[in-house]
């Protein structure tokens, strides 16, 4: 896991003899600077491994290195979801898991990481140069997607360590909007600071923050966020054509994903169709996902992937026993 940089607490200098306007002019840069310094970029890592025991079996592990609550994870292959990629599994923290052949087993490993075992022979079998992508929708960051594939010369049973994958996409509506505001803020801040440098400095009481504090961590996007800037979207063509969902066998029956058409993965719809919409606060989350969750209740009974989940017509809380466990 990535170690986190500890950001020093930045405090605006005391107003001293400055007037109200001067005070406001001074506070704004500090607020913007704090935003610039602390604006961490979420990352997604993907690890793909071929099992030594079964050469047609792959294990995909993905993790999210953001601070928000994960609201949906979509795993696809053959390229990013919605760009020719085929959905293999959808994992929701309260609605459970949905998977399609050749996905054998999708599971949450921790609150921020998932794993998926793929197996197959014939048409639906993955092959060594297949690209696998994981998309994490989170609040408030939006959606982040990373892709990875087996290293070309990897031996069965071996894999590259899980690192942030080279292909990372932030959904424009959610992330780039925020990034744009921050970028504008940072540019404006630099402009203000430069302008401030050429003015006689007002007499200020000494700041409680050391002079080095603002420089403690220059705001630079991480490798993954640079990938997001330089490769806003990438489609990978693989010589291995994954099976379409038309031939895939759902793991369970009708449930919260009941409205998903079987051909959804070939078009930007289905499990990830709503993800380019800015993610609202959790309270209104379901309304964004209506295409995916149809008329399902707020949560189905706790069943494993092999069991059928039926939406309860009586409404969101109708299916619950104590704390939702029946």
């Amino acid at each position: 896991m990535r170690t986190e940089a500890q950001v020093p607490a930045l405090q605006p200098p005391e107003p001293g003899l400055e007037g109200a306007m001067g005070h406001r002019t001074l506070v704004l840069p500090w607020v913007l600077l704090t935003l610039c310094v602390t604006a961490g970029t979420p990352e997604v890592w993907v690890q793909v491994r071929m099992e030594a025991t079964e050469l047609s079996s792959f294990t995909i592990r993905c993790g999210f290195l953001g601070s928000g609550s994960i609201s949906l994870v979509t795993v696809s292959w053959g390229g990013p979801n919605g760009a020719g990629g085929t959905t293999l599994a959808v994992l929701h923290p309260e609605r459970g898991i949905r998977q399609w052949a050749p996905a054998r087993q999708a599971r949450w490993e921790t609150q921020s990481s998932i794993s998926l075992i793929l197996e197959g022979s014939g048409a639906s079998s993955p092959c060594a140069n297949t690209t696998f992508c994981c998309k994490f929708a989170s609040f408030p960051e939006g959606s982040w997607e990373a892709c990875g594939s087996l290293p070309p010369s990897s031996d069965p049973g071996l894999s590259a360590p899980p690192t942030p994958a080279p292909i990372l996409r932030a959904d424009l509506a959610g992330i780039l909007g925020v990034s744009g505001v921050l970028l504008f803020g940072c540019v404006y801040l630099l402009h203000l600071l430069r302008r401030h440098k050429h003015r006689p400095a007002p007499r200020l009481q000494p700041s409680r923050t050391s002079p080095q504090a603002p420089r403690a961590r220059a705001w630079a996007p991480s490798q993954a966020s640079q990938a997001a800037l330089h490769v806003p979207y990438a489609t990978i063509n693989t010589s291995c054509r994954p099976a379409t969902l038309d031939t895939a066998h759902p793991h369970g029956g009708p449930s919260w994903w009941a409205s998903l058409p079987t051909h959804a993965a070939h078009r930007p719809q289905g499990p990830a169709a709503w993800a380019s919409t800015p993610i609202p606060a959790r309270g209104s989350f379901v309304s964004v996902e209506n295409g995916l969750y149809a008329q399902a209740g707020e949560r189905p009974p706790h069943t494993g992937p092999g069991l059928t989940l039926f939406p309860d017509p009586r409404g969101p809380r109708a299916m619950e026993g104590p704390l939702g466990v029946r």
Partner: antibody, heavy 118, light 107 residues
């Protein structure tokens, strides 16, 4: 209904071993991880470890490594915890719980009380 | 392993009071913290996951907050049925570790 049914209370002598069982109904244990948690009287909880019933791979807290052994039998949808070389410190309630279908322990067994007495 | 230090160990409150329980991790666990409630003679039940996401069906008087190393669980208006043991769990890194627990008693 999704449930984890645990075996009955055990009364054992110091130095002995005990095997606890946890049988799942309403879901297949192959689709989740099974974790074991220890709770001593009037104390907090200790994570013993987890097992992946699909392949038998397990992971333990170093505190329990060597004395605890987790196994599963997918044909009977049952997970087992074996504790050896028991001491009075092992007197506790042992819970099995599932993780993986959701990113938290959503279903717990009722617990098995193990009492080590001289 | 990561140590989760939970305070206080005991809370004696009256119905209607507001209570806060804290868990401090010995290193960052990001938001991978869960809060459970365990009533006497029962198995634990999930209240909060992702440090601040309230589980479906959990009354909104229960809230969680925090990120990194400092986490707080709050009951805004304690009710008689909230008498229980509350504990946090981190699943950020293995071995997973629990807080020592807070026993809430009603006057």
């Amino acid at each position: 209904e999704v449930q984890l049914q645990q075996s009955g209370a055990e009364l054992v002598k110091p130095g002995a071993s005990v095997r606890l069982s946890c049988t799942a109904s309403g879901f297949s244990i192959r689709d989740t991880y099974i974790h074991w948690v220890k709770q001593r009287p009037e104390q907090g909880l200790d994570w013993i470890g987890k097992i992946d019933p699909a392949n038998g791979k397990s992971e333990y807290d170093p505190k329990f490594q060597g004395r605890a052994t987790m196994t599963t039998d997918t044909s009977s949808n049952t997970a087992y915890l074996q504790l050896s070389s028991l001491t009075s410190e092992d007197t506790a309630v042992y819970y099995c719980t599932r993780y993986g279908y959701y990113p938290y322990f959503d279903v717990w067994g009722a617990g098995t009380t193990v009492t080590v007495f001289s | 392993s990561i140590v989760m230090t939970q305070t206080p160990k005991f809370l004696l409150v009256s119905a209607g009071d507001r209570v806060a329980i804290t868990c401090k991790a010995s290193q960052s666990v990001r938001h991978d913290v869960v809060w459970y409630q365990q009533k006497p003679g029962q198995s634990p039940k999930l209240l909060i996951y992702y440090a601040s996401s309230r589980y479906t069906g959990v009354p909104d008087r229960f809230t969680g907050s925090g990120y990194g190393t400092d986490f707080t669980f709050t009951i805004s208006t304690v009710q008689a049925e909230d008498l229980a043991l509350y504990f946090c769990l981190q699943d950020f890194s293995s071995p997973w570790t629990f807080g020592g627990g807070t026993k809430l008693e009603i006057k």
